[in-house]
């Protein structure tokens, strides 16, 4: 059994989250995850879910009684979601920590917007994909 | 030229973000995007970047002078990042809007944690992948 299971059960007790009323009004994450089978779509959703848990754990970092559980779960998330890649985890954390109300951050974000947008679609990454996409479009147009 | 380019230039003027000092102290997003070539890694990072821009745009929603630009850019993000898939965009927005201090949300998140964790690594999705991973591990162990 993965180490997180026991610790997650401990958090369930603390948050009284095993209670039947918790399931009222649907799920937060599980229903959404069910909707997406494609790996890249799942990563888009899981990225938001993982950042939510990191924020939640950060919010409760002064509760000593659950710190061991939180640390174990975070470490297991690190293994599962970031493949224990510290650089990946650090870059992710950087992105989650930018303040949307900091003027310098706002200006930088707008400064980088055109380049960020240009990279958003998978096709933007490789000339090869772009070309095949153009051919596909051409074929469709000529049908 | 994509419609967002002209509108992003308009935002640059508004935020005075074309100024040379904006590039001081490195980039927010571009440096991080350069680090990741693998599509699923890029999606993890882009998910955070896109949610940052959505938050930024929301923050400026009462500035009428930039609303047209913001709407055009958001629409183009929708096309590029969500492949114009409304369901994908809606699920994403749902995830970004959960409040980390709402007790009901906290309890639900903890209630779902074990299942979320079980789905985090790509291997968790298919028995086939899991088996090949086990074989790979076995091979490594016997070397």
């Amino acid at each position: 059994q993965d180490p997180y299971v026991k610790e997650a059960e401990n958090l369930k007790k603390y948050f009284n989250a095993g209670h039947s009323d918790v399931a009222d009004n649907g799920t937060l994450f599980l229903g959404i995850l069910k909707n997406w089978k494609e790996e890249s779509d799942r990563k888009i959703m899981q990225s938001q879910i993982v950042s939510f848990y990191f924020k939640l754990f950060k919010n409760f970092k002064d509760d000593q009684s659950i710190q061991k559980s939180v640390e174990t779960i975070k470490e297991d998330m690190n293994v599962k979601f970031f493949n224990s890649n510290k650089k990946k985890r650090d870059d992710f954390e950087k992105l989650t920590n930018y303040s949307v109300t900091d003027l310098n951050v706002q200006r930088k974000a707008i400064h980088e917007l055109i380049q960020v947008m240009a990279e958003l679609s998978p096709a933007a990454k490789t000339g090869k994909r772009k070309r095949s996409q153009m051919l596909f479009r051409g074929r469709r147009a000529s049908q | 030229q994509d419609p967002y380019v002209k509108e992003a230039e308009n935002l640059k003027k508004y935020f005075n973000a074309g100024h040379s000092d904006v590039a001081d102290n490195g980039t927010l997003f571009l440096g991080i995007l350069k680090n990741w070539k693998e599509e699923s890694d890029r999606k993890i990072m882009q998910s955070q970047i896109v949610s940052f821009y959505f938050k930024l745009f929301k923050n400026f929603k009462d500035d009428q002078s930039i609303q047209k630009s913001v709407e055009t850019i958001k629409e183009d993000m929708n096309v590029k990042f969500f492949n114009s898939n409304k369901k994908k965009r809606d699920d994403f927005e749902k995830l970004t809007n959960y409040s980390v201090t709402d007790l009901n949300v906290q309890r639900k998140a903890i209630h779902e944690l074990i299942q979320v964790m079980a789905e985090l690594s790509p291997a968790a999705k298919t028995g086939k992948r899991k088996r090949s991973q086990m074989l790979f591990r076995g091979r490594r162990a016997s070397q």
């Epitope: 603390y14 409760f60 002064d62 009684s65 | 007790l103």
Partner: nanobody, 120 residues
Framework: QVQLVESGGGLVQTGDSLRLSCVAS????????MGWFRQPPGKERDFVAR????????SYATSVEGRFAISRDNAKNTVYLQMNSLKPEDTAVYYC?????????????WGQGTQVTVSS
């Protein structure tokens, strides 16, 4: 034995704001989590908000999330509840409580309460 004294209640109009205070004595205030609860007329006492000993570990009832803000000043042994955009359904006696260590919002000591009435 911890003593808790609430203040700041009163009669206000819909949409107004109020700030409740709760002063603690007789214990090491900075070592325990604090919470606010409320009891509307004819109903049970219910959780409103909680805050950990250092000002983190915050939770709100869904009904007040985004309108109420809990904070604390350990130097003054005081916990606050800032209540904005008040509604008639916020009418209740508001109680401050210290919370049992290692629990999310299980109270061990209560104040005597302060009445908040929101008229439409």
């Amino acid at each position: 034995q911890v003593q808790l004294v609430e203040s700041g209640g009163g009669l206000v109009q819909t949409g107004d704001s109020l700030r409740l205070s709760c002063v603690a004595s007789g214990g090491t205030f900075s070592r325990y989590a604090m919470g606010w609860f409320r009891q509307p007329p004819g109903k049970e006492r219910d959780f409103v908000a909680r805050i950990g000993y250092s000002g983190q570990s915050i939770s709100y009832a869904t009904s007040v999330e985004g309108r109420f803000a809990i904070s604390r000043d350990n130097a003054k042994n005081t916990v606050y509840l800032q209540m904005n955009s008040l509604k008639p359904e916020d009418t209740a006696v508001y109680y401050c409580a210290s919370l049992v260590s290692g629990t999310l919002y299980k109270p061990n000591y209560w104040g005597q309460g302060t009445q908040v009435t929101v008229s439409s």
